[in-house]
């Protein structure tokens, strides 16, 4: 009989698990890109927007060569958890403008959750430690205004897009080293 219910089975092929994570990440990247474009269409952004509570981008062209699987998966999961909280916050704190994007934001949140579960599973199959975030999650305060929440939405979607873009590259590179 197989392993007891609820215990992670050790994957015979971690590359297949990684493939599946890459597929989910790519799919989420496409959704994010589409929603970010919708945002720009509906609520044109005047320049770049940032949000102090968002994680800083973990990867860059210079760091790609030195990536290690445990570090990438851990950091990616921590960052995506932060983006998950931000999307959840956006949906709850939004005024009527963003409520018009509620179905898309809801779907994005659900897919983010699915990717987080997949990464968690991948980490347990690879027997990697389930690292907790460095610091406890800071409660997100209310946007200063409706315009503030629109700017926040631009920042969240833009940051998530960049994070997922680098995640796909990083995961694909790591797959070649497995």
């Amino acid at each position: 009989p197989g392993p007891p219910a609820g215990s992670p089975r050790v994957s015979s092929d971690p590359r297949a698990d990684l493939d599946s994570a890459v597929l989910l990440t790519r799919s989420l990247l496409a959704d994010t890109r589409q929603l970010a474009a919708q945002m720009r269409d509906k609520f044109p952004a005047d320049g770049d927007h940032n949000l102090d509570s968002l994680p800083t981008l973990a990867m860059s062209a210079g760091t790609l060569g030195s990536l290690q699987l445990p570090g990438v998966l851990t950091r990616l999961r921590v960052d995506l958890m932060s983006y998950f909280r931000h999307v959840q916050w956006l949906r709850r704190a939004a005024g009527p403008s963003l409520k018009t994007l509620e179905p898309e934001l809801g779907a994005l949140q659900a897919r983010l959750e699915r990717l987080l579960r997949r990464l968690q599973l991948l980490m347990s199959r690879l027997a990697l430690p389930q690292a907790a975030p460095d610091q406890p999650a800071v409660p997100l305060g209310p946007p200063a205004s409706a315009w503030g929440s629109i700017r926040a939405a631009h920042a969240i979607l833009g940051g998530l897009h960049l994070t997922l873009d680098w995640a796909v590259r990083g995961l694909l590179l790591l797959k070649t080293r497995l």
């Epitope: 704190a93 009527p96 403008s97 409520k99 503030g148």
Partner: antibody, heavy 117, light 111 residues
Framework: QVQLVESGGGVVQPGRSLRLSCAAS????????MHWVRQAPGKGLEWVAV????????FYADSVKGRFTISRDNSKNTLYLQMNSLRAEDTAVYYC??????????WGQGTLVTVSS | QSVLTQPPSASGTPGQRVTISCSGS????????VNWYQQLPGTAPKLLIY???LRPSGVPDRFSGSKSGTSASLAISGLRSEDEADYYC???????????FGGGTKLTVLG
């Protein structure tokens, strides 16, 4: 400081129209979504309508849909509520309220609308 | 009939702690922030609690909000005579695409 002042209330016959105004000052009006909330005499609060900061998105309560229109003029820092086909049950104090997102942080003092023949 | 359900009245003596409940559903309280407003007789409502449990500046820490699932509550400790007012809970409702209020709770401070 933030100020919201409603005007335009009064006594009107059923079936007639009325336009309420809300003059805003003390903040950047064009950055905030705005709502109308009403309160019938001796009753609770009832949400009426909301308009987004730019005026492009509007939502209405079922009880006023098709009869009331919310609008704004950001150049004049003014919010409006055009009320047509008024009914006796529309009699209430009408408040305008500012929202940064999901809550009303500032309210006007209200203007009374009485629909009576 | 209000979408959010509150008890019509509540009472307490000075110094006591009172709690006002607000019950909703997954489309309002369950998925959006809850806000509480205080309306003193003859005046406009005033924001008391927002984002489920945050207090605007100027609101005493005797007032606190909490939420669990599809219900929320407002607690007032160290009750004072000036707390006598109507209290309303409110939230956005995703199904109705609008703001919903509770029917209001009239708080009486006895003695």
């Amino acid at each position: 400081q933030v100020q919201l002042v409603e005007s335009g209330g009064g006594v009107v016959q059923p079936g007639r129209s009325l336009r309420l105004s809300c003059a805003a000052s003390g903040f950047t009006f064009s950055h905030y979504d705005m709502h109308w909330v009403r309160q019938a005499p001796g009753k609770g609060l009832e949400w009426v309508a909301v308009i987004s900061y730019s005026g492009s998105v509007k939502f209405y309560a079922d009880s006023v849909k098709g009869r009331f229109t919310i609008s704004r003029d950001n150049s004049k820092n003014t919010l409006y509520l055009q009320m047509n086909s008024l009914r006796a049950e529309d009699t209430a104090v009408y408040y305008c309220a500012r929202t940064p997102g999901s809550h009303f942080d500032y309210w006007g003092q209200g203007t009374l609308v009485t629909v009576s023949s | 009939q209000s979408v959010l359900t509150q008890p019509p009245s509540a009472s307490g003596t000075p110094g006591q702690r009172v709690t006002i409940s607000c019950s909703g559903s997954s489309s309002n309280i369950g998925s959006n922030y809850v806000n509480w407003y205080q309306q003193l007789p003859g005046t406009a409502p005033k924001l008391l609690i927002y984002y489920d449990d945050l207090r605007p500046s100027g609101v005493p820490d005797r007032f606190s909000g909490s939420k669990s699932g599809t219900s929320a509550s407002l607690a007032i400790s160290g009750l004072r005579s000036e707390d006598e007012a109507d209290y309303y809970c409110s939230a956005w409702d995703d199904s109705l695409s609008g703001v919903v209020f509770g029917g209001g709770t009239k708080l009486t401070v006895l003695g």
